[in-house]
């Protein structure tokens, strides 16, 4: 079975800068899975942001600002990366990755 690890416990960024969050997949080939990214703001329900499927298709939640989030995967390191552009107060949250095995 696949296993996920987010090596960064926390990430502190200056306003308007770019944040990159990593999710390392083990126990399964990343190219045979879909990786989903979610965020949970304090006091709010968890929210789907973006996913990258086994075939590389990217799906973004409607209502999420365009250009705010970018998702990628690096098969060599079995890692999925969530990039958050122009970090703002509204981006302060806990970010989770999740796996769906094909």
């Amino acid at each position: 079975a696949g296993h996920l690890e987010q090596p960064q416990i926390s990430s502190t960024k200056t306003l308007s800068k770019t944040a990159r969050l990593e999710c390392v997949v083990s126990g399964i080939t990343i190219s045979a899975t879909s990786v989903y990214w979610y965020r949970e703001r304090p006091g709010e329900v968890i929210q789907f942001l973006v996913s990258i499927s086994y075939d590389g298709t990217v799906r973004k939640e409607s209502g999420i600002p365009s250009g705010k989030f970018e998702v990628d995967r690096i098969p060599e390191t079995s890692t999925s990366t969530l990039t958050i552009h122009n970090v703002e107060k509204q981006d302060i949250a806990t970010y989770y990755c999740a796996l769906w095995e094909v």
Epitope: E88, K89, I92
Partner: antibody
Framework: EVQLVESGGGLVKPGGSLRLSCAAS????????MNWVRQAPGKGLEWVSS????????YYADSVKGRCTISRDNARNSLYLQMNSLRAEDTAIYYC?????????????????WGQGTMVTVSS | EIVLTQSPGTLSLSPGERATLSCRAS???????LAWYQQKPGQAPRLLIY???SRATGIPDRFSGSGSGTDFTLTISRLEPEDFAVYYC??????????FGQGTKLEIK
């Protein structure tokens, strides 16, 4: 001194348009989310619209959605509210207000600096 | 949409007395997202309390906020003449971001 100064209010006929402006000074404008709040004569406060520091997140009250557009120019330290298809019920004092930012408890959202407001009257 | 209901609508007290103002939410509100404002006639609102219980800069310690979930309270321990005004609670949420209560008018008895 931290200051917000609104302008652009006035008398307009129903169906008309107005553009409100808010000039900010005394703080790093591009680090703060900003808001418009209105108050009809003799009534309570009503949130109208919000915009995040880099303009990624924009929200509107249902009462103005589709008729108002919030924007900001961080280079000019200015906040705007374009109001179209104005109605009598839009008559109010419009306040520009700053979110308290990310110092200290950055999870809290509240409006810590307010302008004195600009009056918008919609009447034929 | 979360609805905030303030009570009482009007509170008549004398200087030196204790004022207790209530704000009830139609559903649970994160304490981090509850604020109180004071507004005097002809003036813009002034932030008193944020995060349900933290006093804003320059606010006297006779003002205090408390509560969690759906019930929040603003207490003024000993009323001064300048405290007579209208008080609003406000919440920040996800849809829409902000809602205000209808206000409580604190008047001199």
């Amino acid at each position: 001194e931290v200051q917000l100064v609104e302008s652009g209010g006035g008398l307009v006929k129903p169906g008309g348009s107005l553009r409100l402006s808010c000039a900010a000074s005394g703080f790093t404008f591009n680090s703060y989310d900003m808001n418009w709040v209105r108050q009809a004569p003799g009534k309570g406060l009503e949130w109208v619209s919000s915009i995040s520091s880099s303009s990624s997140y924009i929200y509107y009250a249902d009462s103005v959605k589709g008729r108002c557009t919030i924007s900001r120019d961080n280079a000019r330290n200015s906040l705007y509210l374009q109001m179209n298809s104005l109605r009598a019920e839009d008559t109010a004092i419009y306040y520009c207000a700053r979110d308290r930012g990310i110092g200290g408890d950055y999870y809290s959202y509240a409006m810590d600096v307010w302008g004195q407001g600009t009056m918008v009257t919609v009447s034929s | 949409e979360i609805v905030l209901t303030q009570s009482p609508g009007t509170l008549s007290l004398s200087p030196g007395e204790r004022a207790t103002l209530s704000c009830r939410a139609s559903q649970s509100v994160s304490s981090s997202y509850l604020a109180w404002y004071q507004q005097k006639p002809g003036q813009a609102p002034r932030l008193l309390i944020y995060g349900a219980s933290s006093r804003a800069t320059g606010i006297p310690d006779r003002f205090s906020g408390s509560g969690s979930g759906t019930d929040f309270t603003l207490t003024i321990s000993r009323l001064e003449p300048e405290d007579f005004a209208v008080y609003y609670c406000q919440q920040y949420g996800s849809s829409p971001p902000y809602t205000f209560g209808q206000g409580t008018k604190l008047e001199i008895k």
